[in-house]
């Protein structure tokens, strides 16, 4: 994995320490030849949780196009899910217009949907370079 990236089960992970909106975080990961993290298992969830700290952190899951979709095409319907109770709730009460269309890890690691413009930390994921 590149310097400052962590390896886990054949993937490399980079944990931000600053905040960006979901679209900006998504773009940042793409520019690093990566994508916002896609959580495929309870074990991967635990790994991410251990390294991210107890703060809201964007992941690569969004319903900005209608259905919930992982950014790498992983099937949401059959895949791992770890929503907080009562979530996702597409809350309109924030008063910003529209609901909540982007998913993030909460302080306890479970997921919540929120307004995509919130400046949260984020995690990038990339396949490990077999040559390294």
């Amino acid at each position: 994995c590149p310097v400052n990236w962590l390896e886990y089960e054949g993937s490399c992970y980079w944990f931000s320490r600053s905040g960006k909106s979901w679209p900006e975080a998504d773009k940042y990961c793409q520019l690093e030849s990566a994508h916002l993290v896609v959580v495929n298992s309870r074990e991967e969830q635990k790994f991410i949780q251990h390294h991210m700290g107890p703060v809201n952190t964007w992941m690569g899951l969004t319903d900005q196009s209608g259905p919930w979709k992982w950014v790498d095409g992983t099937d949401y319907e059959t895949g791992f899910k770890n929503w907080r109770p009562e979530q996702p709730d597409d809350w309109y009460g924030h008063g910003l217009g529209g609901g909540e269309d982007c998913a993030h890890f909460t302080d306890d690691g479970r997921w919540n949907d929120d307004v995509c413009q919130r400046p949260y930390r984020w995690v990038c994921e990339a396949a490990r370079d077999p040559a390294t």
């Epitope: 196009s65 209608g66 919930w68 949401y76 899910k81 597409d90 309109y92 269309d101």
Partner: antibody, heavy 117, light 107 residues
Framework: EVQLVESGGGLVKPGGSLRLSCAAS????????MNWVRQAPGKGLEWVSS????????YYADSVKGRFTISRDNAKNSLYLQMNSLRAEDTAVYFC??????????WGQGTLVTVSS | DIQMTQSPSSLSASVGDRVTITCRAS??????LNWYQQKPGKAPKLLIY???SLQSGVPSRFSGSGSGTDFTLTISSLQPEDFATYYC?????????FGPGTKVDIK
């Protein structure tokens, strides 16, 4: 395949009650807000009610507030609309639809409710 | 509540024509504007969401634009299957509201 199928429509007298159902399949039902939209004969679309995935948030059009109740059973992948104190102006095709701020998709085929004496 | 208006209420056009339908909101809805197509006896079909995003499976001749209060649905080259009624809908805040519709029929 993502699919919604409504049922429960029919003929009812003014002041009567009816319960509509919408059976969902092909997606994780609890992850989505659901909606009821109606269309009176020869008229346009009217939003009726919405409910969030876990029923935490519920919204109604003023025209049905206090008379209609939206609910869902995520274990049964089903959405409901309990309609009480029905009026002639409630006569319409009732559609259920998935979604929220990014639009409603898909829609069911609709079920006709006729309120007449 | 946010009121939605559409113009024209109906229009006659020929196959191949460029068709434009406008939708206006009574207050700013940023980009939370969706367009639907409905054919007689059928359920509405989502065409465009958040003003300009083309719904999956919808032909590219359909496009949407606008923000704030003024929005446009354009059909670049009308096809026989496009004769239908078109509705705009705001999803900025509750209660959600639809426009009255625009019927597109054959000239």
């Amino acid at each position: 395949e993502v699919q919604l199928v409504e049922s429960g429509g029919g003929l009812v007298k003014p002041g009567g009650s009816l319960r509509l159902s919408c059976a969902a399949s092909g997606f994780t039902f609890s992850s989505y807000s659901m909606n009821w939209v109606r269309q009176a004969p020869g008229k346009g679309l009217e939003w009726v009610s919405s409910i969030s995935g876990s029923s935490s948030y519920i919204y109604y059009a003023d025209s049905v507030k206090g008379r209609f109740t939206i609910s869902r059973d995520n274990a049964k992948n089903s959405l409901y609309l309990q309609m009480n104190s029905l009026r002639a102006e409630d006569t319409a095709v009732y559609f259920c639809a998935r979604g929220g701020s990014r639009g409603f998709d898909p829609w069911g085929q609709g079920t006709l409710v006729t309120v007449s004496s | 509540d946010i009121q939605m208006t559409q113009s024209p209420s109906s229009l006659s056009a020929s196959v191949g024509d460029r068709v434009t339908i406008t939708c206006r909101a009574s207050q700013s809805i940023t980009s939370y504007l969706n367009w639907y197509q409905q054919k007689p006896g059928k359920a509405p079909k989502l065409l465009i969401y958040t003003a300009s995003s083309l719904q999956s499976g919808v032909p590219s001749r359909f496009s949407g634009s606008g923000s704030g209060t003024d929005f446009t649905l354009t059909i670049s080259s009308l096809q026989p299957e496009d004769f239908a009624t078109y509705y705009c809908q705001q999803s900025h805040s509750f209660p959600f509201t639809f426009g009255p519709g625009t019927k597109v029929d054959i000239k």
